[in-house]
């Protein structure tokens, strides 16, 4: 019979012969022959192969370097790579996410417009007139000034973007 020019799915052509690929989680030790099947071996600890393959070496699991603010989100298996994520309170510095950086806080006078995620930093906005923030925070929005009127009080000290208004009693000595 004519030697094959193409092989079925999960096979590969070698020496004019179709050999079975190794299944995910295993690497190739030796090609098949006319008389023997393809020989495969499981990947070692901390190694993986995620496809049907003819690789002679497994890939090393990704290292989630705590030095770069990374931690393990999902431990790798013989068939899957480790998935890294940023430490709590940190976010990726780029799409590649090879390192992370601490979320920023919004300074007094600024409030959180958008809370940081694993891939984006905190977005701050200046507190507009009528609002204030007196803390440095990665979570707190600008708070509205206290309404003295609703408490039957008057403004004794005006508020700023960093301080609330100070309310005081109404002046009862009016003529």
């Amino acid at each position: 019979p004519e030697p094959p020019t193409a092989c079925r799915e999960k096979q590969y052509l070698i020496n004019s012969q179709c050999c079975s690929l190794c299944q995910p989680g295993q690497k190739l030790v030796s090609d098949c022959t006319e008389f023997t099947e393809t020989e495969c071996l499981p990947c070692g600890e901390s190694e993986f192969l995620d496809t049907w393959n003819r690789e002679t070496h497994c890939h090393q699991h990704k290292y989630c370097d705590p030095n770069l603010g990374l931690r393990v989100q999902q431990k790798g298996t013989s068939e899957t790579d480790t998935i890294c994520t940023c430490e709590e309170g940190w976010h990726c510095t780029s799409e590649a996410c090879e390192s992370c950086v601490l979320h920023r806080s919004c300074s007094p006078g600024f409030g959180v417009k958008q809370i940081a995620t694993g891939v984006s930093d905190t977005i701050c906005e200046p507190c507009p007139v009528g609002f204030f923030s007196n803390v440095s925070s990665a979570f707190e929005k600008c708070h509205p000034w206290t309404s003295c009127e609703t408490k039957d009080l008057v403004v004794q000290q005006a508020g700023t973007n960093k301080t609330d208004v100070v309310c005081g009693p109404q002046d009862r000595l009016r003529a």
Epitope: P66, N67, L68, G69, T93, S94, E95, A96, E98, S99, V101, L102, R104, S105, D121, S136
Partner: antibody, heavy 115, light 107 residues
């Protein structure tokens, strides 16, 4: 091998500005932040801020806002720090370092402000 | 800003001794603390991060411990090449802040 190569020493007059550089090699420049740290003789270290070369986002220590400006150039894998309105208090060694936890540091740029 | 206080500006030791350098944070920083060694004319060198993790290539005579507000860098079996300045740093919140440093010198 990862390396951060900083520009040479600077002697400048009070009131002037200076721009120092930090050239990165041996890694993908845009995947890691570059932070800057000030060291005055006989004193501790002071964190100035960082730049993320991927997004050009900066984060400054309030104390250095208006004093330091951080920029970067992806094409040359170089981070820059410009210091303005210089006084004798700005005389120090300035270090650039990769990552928030300073894994790799430049050799430092000595700035002397003197008339 | 979080203040990192290194109570000893200088510490005297002898080769072979065990020495502990302390650092106190003005508020809880969890374990977000690093220790650096700096020798004259050199840039700082990372020794410990996340309070107790030894950086690659750092000899195991350097040990970090602590969490919250109290942190310690211990050098067991001090060698002459360990004579240097040691700085703690918090990276729990911005701005990152350093201790004033502890200079390790020979008795």
């Amino acid at each position: 091998e990862f390396q951060l190569q900083q520009s040479g020493p600077e002697l400048v007059k009070p009131g002037a500005s200076v721009k120092m550089s930090c050239k990165a090699s041996g890694y993908t420049f845009t995947n890691y932040i570059i932070q800057w740290v000030k060291k005055q003789p006989g004193q501790g270290l002071e964190w100035i801020g960082y730049i993320n070369p991927y997004s050009s986002e900066t984060n400054y220590n309030e104390k250095f806002k208006g004093k330091a400006t951080l920029t970067s150039d992806k094409s040359s894998s170089t981070a820059y720090m410009e210091l303005s309105s210089l006084t004798s208090e700005d005389s120090a060694i300035y270090f650039c370092a990769r990552d928030l936890i300073g894994n790799y540091w430049g050799q430092g740029t000595t700035l002397t402000v003197s008339s | 800003d979080i203040v990192m206080t290194q109570s000893h500006k200088f510490m005297s030791t002898s080769v072979g001794d065990r020495v502990s350098i302390t650092c106190k944070a003005s508020q809880d920083v969890g374990t977000a603390v690093a220790w650096y060694q700096q020798k004259p004319g050199q840039s700082p060198k990372l020794l410990i991060y996340w309070a107790s993790t030894r950086h690659t290539g750092v000899p195991d005579r350097f040990t970090g411990s602590g969490s919250g507000t109290d942190f310690t860098l211990t050098i067991s079996n001090v060698q002459s090449e360990d004579l240097a300045d040691y700085f703690c740093q918090q990276y729990s919140s911005y701005p990152l802040t350093f201790g004033a440093g502890t200079k390790l010198e020979l008795k």
